[in-house]
């Protein structure tokens, strides 16, 4: 249902926001162990004025890389809801501006984590740091769009 504007963002608030908040809540412990280094994705893809749809389109695509990364089914379900829901709502709002499909790689760190952890642990932590930031940015960007639709 394309009622993101007509009902003050009810689709976002009742589906996407709930899933984003559930995911972020389950990742509360992640953050203190994350390095300060900026991920390449966030250097290149920013939720700037008139580019919100472009950012969210790529962010949703990036989210799909994290499906099955986590062991719990609930986590995957919420990821899927956010990824698919974002893509659907972008089409509703006319915000989407896609590009050629990409071969999905994994989130790349800009620097390696402390050397005393195994590479596998490093990578998993790094991926979770990236995922948490991605979800936070998606939430912020949707809120920016909704503020705009309520103002006009």
């Amino acid at each position: 249902d394309c009622d993101i504007e007509g009902k003050d963002g009810k689709q976002y608030e009742s589906v996407l926001m709930v899933s984003i908040d559930q995911l972020l809540d389950s990742m509360k412990e992640i953050g203190s162990n994350c390095l300060n280094n900026e991920f390449n994705f966030f250097k290149r893809h920013i939720c700037d004025a008139n580019k919100e749809g472009m950012f969210l389109f790529r962010a949703a695509r990036k989210l799909r890389q994290f499906l099955k990364m986590n062991s719990t089914g609930d986590f995957d379900l919420h990821l899927l809801k956010v990824s698919e829901g974002t893509t659907i709502l972008l089409n509703c709002t006319g915000q989407v501006k896609g590009r050629k499909p990409a071969a999905l790689g994994e989130a790349q760190p800009t620097k390696s984590l402390e050397e005393n952890k195994s590479l596998k642990e490093q990578k998993k932590l790094n991926d979770l740091c990236f995922l948490k930031r991605l979800l936070q940015e998606i939430k912020t960007c949707w809120n920016k769009i909704l503020m705009g639709t309520k103002e006009h």
Partner: antibody, heavy 117, light 111 residues
Framework: QVQLVESGGGVVQPGRSLRLSCAAS????????LHWVRQAPGKGLEWLAA???????DYNAAFISRFTISRDNSKNTLYLQMNSLRAEDTAVYYC???????????WGQGTLVTVSS | DIQMTQSPSSLSASVGDRVTITCKAS??????????INWYQQKPGKAPKLLIY???NLESGVPARFSGSGSGTDFTLTISSLQPEDFATYYC?????????FGGGTKVEIK
């Protein structure tokens, strides 16, 4: 509207230091990456460094030993500390706000640094 | 470092002409479905101005006569019908890899 205003340029002797400032307004300063780019007289553009929202930095390797980028979010100001200046550092120095695709979406008017004895 | 080679370095054209500027990267600037090339216009004594980002996206407020295309290593900036205010120097820039690098510029002059 987005505004970036550089200051701190001028004539300096070789081997000396200089700190450039870039005062920003019209956007949420702490939410954006920022860059320094320079242009020697009659020449092309050269990227120097970037600083990201969390404070991490990227440098052009040619300048990492002499130049330091920093930001003060409470003052909405970006800085470039330049040490051991050489004649070839003579240029107009621009600050720029990061844009989509790591482009330079907004630029200051530039500040001229002349290194001469 | 990724080298960006622009051609021609200068060109003369008349108002109304279609102008094409090319930019060649020393290696691919594509990643995850996007081409990380941006185009700028610079007039004498002024700061550069962003025209095109991520190869083909027109920056807000830039006239539709400007367009960008290409992928991999070969990119093009096209001005469909040159206007008097378009006489300037144009630069391409890659952002796929640090250090961010620019082409040498293309000066568009009046014929």
């Amino acid at each position: 509207q987005v505004q970036l205003v550089e200051s701190g340029g001028g004539v300096v002797q070789p081997g000396r230091s200089l700190r450039l400032s870039c005062a920003a307004s019209g956007f949420t300063f702490s939410s954006y990456g920022l860059h320094w780019v320079r242009q020697a007289p009659g020449k092309g553009l050269e990227w120097l460094a970037a600083i990201w929202t969390g404070g991490s930095t990227d440098y052009n390797a040619a300048f990492i030993s002499r130049f330091t980028i920093s930001r003060d979010n409470s003052k909405n100001t970006l800085y470039l500390q330049m040490n051991s200046l050489r004649a070839e550092d003579t240029a107009v120095y621009y600050c720029a706000r990061n844009g989509y695709g790591e482009s330079f979406a907004y630029w200051g008017q530039g500040t001229l640094v002349t290194v001469s004895s | 470092d990724i080298q960006m080679t622009q051609s021609p370095s200068s060109l003369s054209a008349s108002v109304g002409d279609r102008v094409t500027i090319t930019c060649k990267a020393s290696q691919s600037v594509d990643d995850d479905g996007d081409s990380f090339i941006n185009w700028y216009q610079q007039k004498p004594g002024k700061a550069p101005k962003l025209l095109i980002y991520v190869a083909s996206n027109l920056e807000s407020g830039v006239p539709a006569r400007f367009s960008g295309s290409g992928s991999g290593t070969d990119f093009t900036l096209t001005i469909s019908s040159l206007q008097p205010e378009d006489f300037a120097t144009y630069y391409c820039q890659q952002s796929n890899e640090d250090p961010l690098t620019f082409g040498g510029g293309t000066k568009v002059e009046i014929k």
